[in-house]
Structure formats: structure tokens, C-alpha cells
Amino acid sequence: FPMFKRGRCLCIGPGVKAVKVADIEKASIMYPSNNCDKIEVIITLKENKGQRCLNPKSKQARLIIKKVERKNF
């Protein structure tokens, strides 16, 4: 996407507060890096309905982050 500067976060704004659990295909956690200084939670929706950013401060995001971290470590 040539219209975007390098070194930007993937999400625009704070993100949605919640996504229906039944609609979630996958959750990806992007940790702070040189490109983006905050954690981002990206939800892939079922049935090719695209992706949404989940507010990392929301209760649902905190649960997802915990779950992912437990699985990875």
C-alpha cells in the first residue's frame, strides 16, 4: 500500500471493544516493535468476513492475550 508511511501500526484507532466469539476464526497478537509502540490484537473473522482490530485494553482482548501467551510459553 504505497499510500501509507512506513513504521505505522496496523490498526487505525483503538479498535472494537468486543467481537462475537462465534465469529472468530483466529486471533493474532502483534507486540510492540520498532514499527508500532503498542500491542495490537487482530481478529480474523469466519466466512471470509475480513479482519478487525480489537481494543487491546478491552476485557475480551486481555483474555485473548492471556490465552495466546499460555499456549506459546
Partner: nanobody, 126 residues
Framework: EVQLVESGGGLVQAGGSLRLSCAAS????????IGWFRQAPGKEREGVSC????????YYADSVKGRFTASSDNAKNTVYLQINSLKPEDTAVYYC???????????????????WGQGTQVTVSS
């Protein structure tokens, strides 16, 4: 009830300028990105800019970079689109839209947005 109301369109000569406004109500303004789109007769709706209400970050289509500037006044829940050096090909109905939880790759895609205004006509005469 969510409302987006555009204003500021009109008839202007090529080379002139316009400032479009989009007044939002019925939702938490800071939680949303506000996109500007345009649709010329017989053409598809085209994304021209997007602004994050929470931090003011802006995104533009290559075709309008340098001529279009989006800004927001969060105290008034209003987003502006300043259009300079207008060309006849800028003639279209201009719409603002609000979307939440967008990735930057979705910033200019109309299907990513949840709420839409009724549009304001911009006509550029040569």
C-alpha cells in the same frame, strides 16, 4: 441514532478550493475512523482519505495526495476535507463514513465502514 451529515459542497471553478465538513453524532467519536469517499456518475465509489479520530493519523489515496487534507475537531465531533487545486475529474458526490476496528489496509475500502452520510455534491467546471 447514528448520524453523519456532510456539507460544504457546491459548484466551483477548476483550480479553486472547497472545505467539506462531516458532522457526526450518536456514537463515541474517538472510537471511529472517518473516511471520505466519492462517487462520480457511472463510476464506482472511491476512497480518497481516512482520518483516525483518536490520534489524527491520516491516510490518502495516491490520486489525491498533496491536494486533499483531512482534519478533525473532536470537540465538535466533526471531520473536514480540504480540497485544493480542484479539477473537473473531482466532480462527484462526496460521502463521509465511520468505521471501527479498521486496519490501515482497509482505510479506503468502502465495505469496511459501518455508517454513511447522505453525501454532498461537488461540481468542478472548467
Amino acid at each position: 441514532e447514528v448520524q453523519l451529515v456532510e456539507s460544504g459542497g457546491g459548484l466551483v471553478q477548476a483550480g479553486g478550493s472547497l472545505r467539506l465538513s462531516c458532522a457526526a453524532s450518536g456514537f463515541t467519536f474517538d472510537d471511529y475512523a472517518i473516511g471520505w469517499f466519492r462517487q462520480a456518475p457511472g463510476k464506482e465509489r472511491e476512497g480518497v482519505s481516512c482520518i483516525s479520530s483518536s490520534d489524527g493519523d491520516t491516510y490518502y489515496a495516491d490520486s489525491v495526495k498533496g491536494r486533499f487534507t483531512a482534519s478533525s475537531d473532536n470537540a465538535k465531533n466533526t471531520v473536514y476535507l480540504q480540497i485544493n487545486s480542484l479539477k473537473p475529474e473531482d466532480t462527484a458526490v462526496y460521502y463521509c463514513a465511520a468505521g471501527q476496528g479498521l486496519l490501515i489496509a482497509q482505510a479506503l475500502r468502502w465495505e469496511s465502514y459501518d455508517y454513511w452520510g447522505q453525501g454532498t455534491q461537488v461540481t468542478v467546471s472548467s
